[in-house]
Structure formats: structure tokens, C-alpha cells
């Protein structure tokens, strides 16, 4: 029951996380900035991974896609890639985890298969969450670096004096959505991995413990014990640990009505 709850909760948390990663990737508010201020109007700017928008205090709003703009930071492509990889991995993970859910029965799927699928989806969620966190963090770092580099930078251009204006910028809402969503996906993935351990069938190999009451020769055989998770299981009747004693296959035992196996 606890395993099912852990798996189900992990799935839901990851689902919310991936939805958040998708939302963050699509959002325009990765960074916000005051571009212009005068007594009558102010121009605010908010930028996303795909387009930049200006909003004026008068109500005017205009968004423009980056398209093939040469002046874009190279890091932007890396952030886009990280976020997309995160979404793709997360989506595949969700698909896999649906079939891995203990509460869903699909044909005669064994528990070991479900455990494997749960682990796979868990790992995918972890990597997806890390991609999102990395993407958002790289963007935040790029933002801080670029603003500091361009502050108070003055030079002469072909059209006359060119100066960089000191403007205030802030991290946009998308950064916080991305960080939280990435964290949730990561937590969901960890929960799936934890659930996988409980889902795996417990394969127990008990070796025979025989009590021979016949005659004066009493043989007590402490047998080896193995609890397996289903990965690299001891399917053949191999000797694991015998503590110096021999198994039933190795010693001749005289049948007796007092023999217990």
C-alpha cells in the first residue's frame, strides 16, 4: 500500500513538475526590465526564450520573436536545448510511468517489469528536473553577467555617440516557475526510484533446514538466505552461503517421519 502511494505521489509530483517546465519554457517573463521612464510614460520590457515584449504604461504591448537575430547570446540556445531536453525526457518518463503504475493492470505484466519501468521513469524525471534547473540557472547567470558587462559601457559608433543606459532588471516569473518545477520533477523522480525498490518482487531462497531425530546423529543445517530486488536474481539453485554446512543436494539424508523441510 505504501509503495503504491509512493509511486502514485511520485507520478503526480512529476506530472505537476513537467507541466511547470513546459509552462516556464513557453513563458515570456524570463527577465523583466524598465527600458524607458519619463514623467508621462514608462516602457517595460519582458523577455522569454522565444520572444521579447514591450509594454507601456499607456497599455500598448508589442511582442517580437527573435527569429534569426545574430546578436542573441549563444547561451540562449543552450538554455532552449536544456529546457526542451527536460520536457522530452519528462514526457517519455510520464508515458513509461503510466504503464508502471501498480494500480493499473495491463495484461499479465509482472511486478519485476513494473519495477524496471518505475526505475526508468524515475531516472528520466530526475534527469528532466536537473535539465530544467540547469537551464534556468544558466539563464539567470547569463542575465546577471550580461547586465554587468553592458553597464556604463560607452563607445563611439558610426551614427555618433552610443551609450548604454543603466536600467533596472529583475528575474522574471518564469525563472522561479522553472526552478520550482525542476525541483518537483526531481523529487517525483526520487519518489519513483524509492517506489521501485518496494515494487520489485522479493525473491527468497531458503535452504533446507533438516532436523534428523533418527538415531544419535542429529544434523542441523543453517541455510543461506537471499532477499532479491529482481535485478540479477538468483534464479538457479546456486549455493549462496552455507556457513560450513552442506545443502540437501550435497549430503545424503535418510528418510524419516521426523524429517522437516
Amino acid at each position: 500500500m505504501a509503495v503504491t502511494a509512493c509511486q502514485g505521489l511520485g507520478f503526480v509530483v512529476s506530472l505537476i513538475g513537467i507541466a511547470g517546465i513546459i509552462a516556464a519554457t513557453c513563458m515570456d517573463q524570463w527577465s523583466t526590465q524598465d527600458l524607458y521612464n519619463n514623467p508621462v510614460t514608462a516602457v517595460f520590457n519582458y523577455q522569454g526564450l522565444w520572444r521579447s515584449c514591450v509594454r507601456e504604461s499607456s497599455g500598448f504591448t508589442e511582442c517580437r520573436g527573435y527569429f534569426t537575430l545574430l546578436g542573441l547570446p549563444a547561451m540562449l540556445q543552450a538554455v532552449r536545448a536544456l529546457m526542451i531536453v527536460g520536457i522530452v525526457l519528462g514526457a517519455i518518463g510520464l508515458l513509461v510511468s503510466i504503464f508502471a503504475l501498480k494500480c493499473i493492470r495491463i495484461g499479465s505484466m509482472e511486478d519485476s517489469a513494473k519495477a524496471n519501468m518505475t526505475l526508468t521513469s524515475g531516472i528520466m524525471f530526475i534527469v528532466s528536473g536537473l535539465c530544467a534547473i540547469a537551464g534556468v540557472s544558466v539563464f539567470a547567470n547569463m542575465l546577471v553577467t550580461n547586465f554587468w558587462m553592458s553597464t556604463a559601457n560607452m563607445y563611439t559608433g558610426m551614427g555618433g555617440m552610443v551609450q548604454t543606459v543603466q536600467t533596472r532588471y529583475t528575474f522574471g516569473a518564469a525563472l522561479f516557475v522553472g526552478w520550482v518545477a525542476g525541483g518537483l520533477t526531481l523529487i517525483g523522480g526520487v519518489m519513483m526510484c524509492i517506489a521501485c525498490r518496494g515494487l520489485a518482487p522479493e525473491e527468497t531462497n531458503y535452504k533446507a533446514v533438516s532436523y534428523h531425530a533418527s538415531g544419535h546423529s542429529v544434523a542441523y543445517k543453517p541455510g543461506g538466505f537471499k532477499a532479491s530486488t529482481g535485478f540479477g536474481s538468483n534464479t538457479k539453485n546456486k549455493k549462496i552461503y552455507d556457513g560450513g554446512a552442506r545443502t540437501e543436494d550435497e549430503v545424503q539424508s535418510y528418510p524419516s517421519k521426523h524429517d522437516y523441510v
Epitope: S57, S58, N146
Partner: nanobody, 120 residues
Amino acid sequence: EVQLVESGGGLVQPGGSLRLSCAASGSFFRIVAMEWYRQAPGKGRELVATITRGGSTYYADSMKGRSTISRDNAKNTVYLQMNSLKPEDTAVYYCNVRVEVPFMQPNDYWGQGTLVTVSS
């Protein structure tokens, strides 16, 4: 890089009118605001008028009621129509554009200036 070409300056009589224009060209992302400044001989540079991308305008008290700023977004051009000119309006008029640079500080580009002389 942005190039600004100003035109329309010259000698005008007091009470006369003049229309200045400033065209921006080159590779840039988006012009956020376009402004006209002026600098009289021996004085500092002062703002005359501003127009934002959305069309919001702002005028300095010195030219309020006597000037009109307009822009053509498609041509990236700003115009300053000045009426009822006075001798104290004599100055070098500079065009300034504020250009948005994605993920960086915006840039202010200045023109070379056009001289307006109000004299009889």
C-alpha cells in the same frame, strides 16, 4: 550597429516653422523610444520631446504647445515639427534612439546633430 541621419535644420526667421527628421538604419532588434534633444551654445544638452514605440509623447516645458513629435515605425523615423520659433530656440538639435538589446542593457544611439538658427 545603428546609424542616425538627421535633416531639416537651417536658418529660420522668428515666428517661423521647421520640421526636423531623423532616420535610423542598420541592424537592431527594436527601437523603444525616439527623442529630440538640443544644445544651445555654452549650455548643456536638454530634452525637447520624446515618443515611445506605442506613440506616447512627452514634451519639455520649453517647447510645450509649440512642437509636435511623431514617428513612422515602419521607416524607423522620428519627426519634430517646431512652430512659433524664437531666437532662444537656436541650438544644435540631436536625435536619440533607445534600442532594445535582448538580455542586455538597452543602447542609446545619438545622431551627429543638425543646427537650427532662429534669426531675423
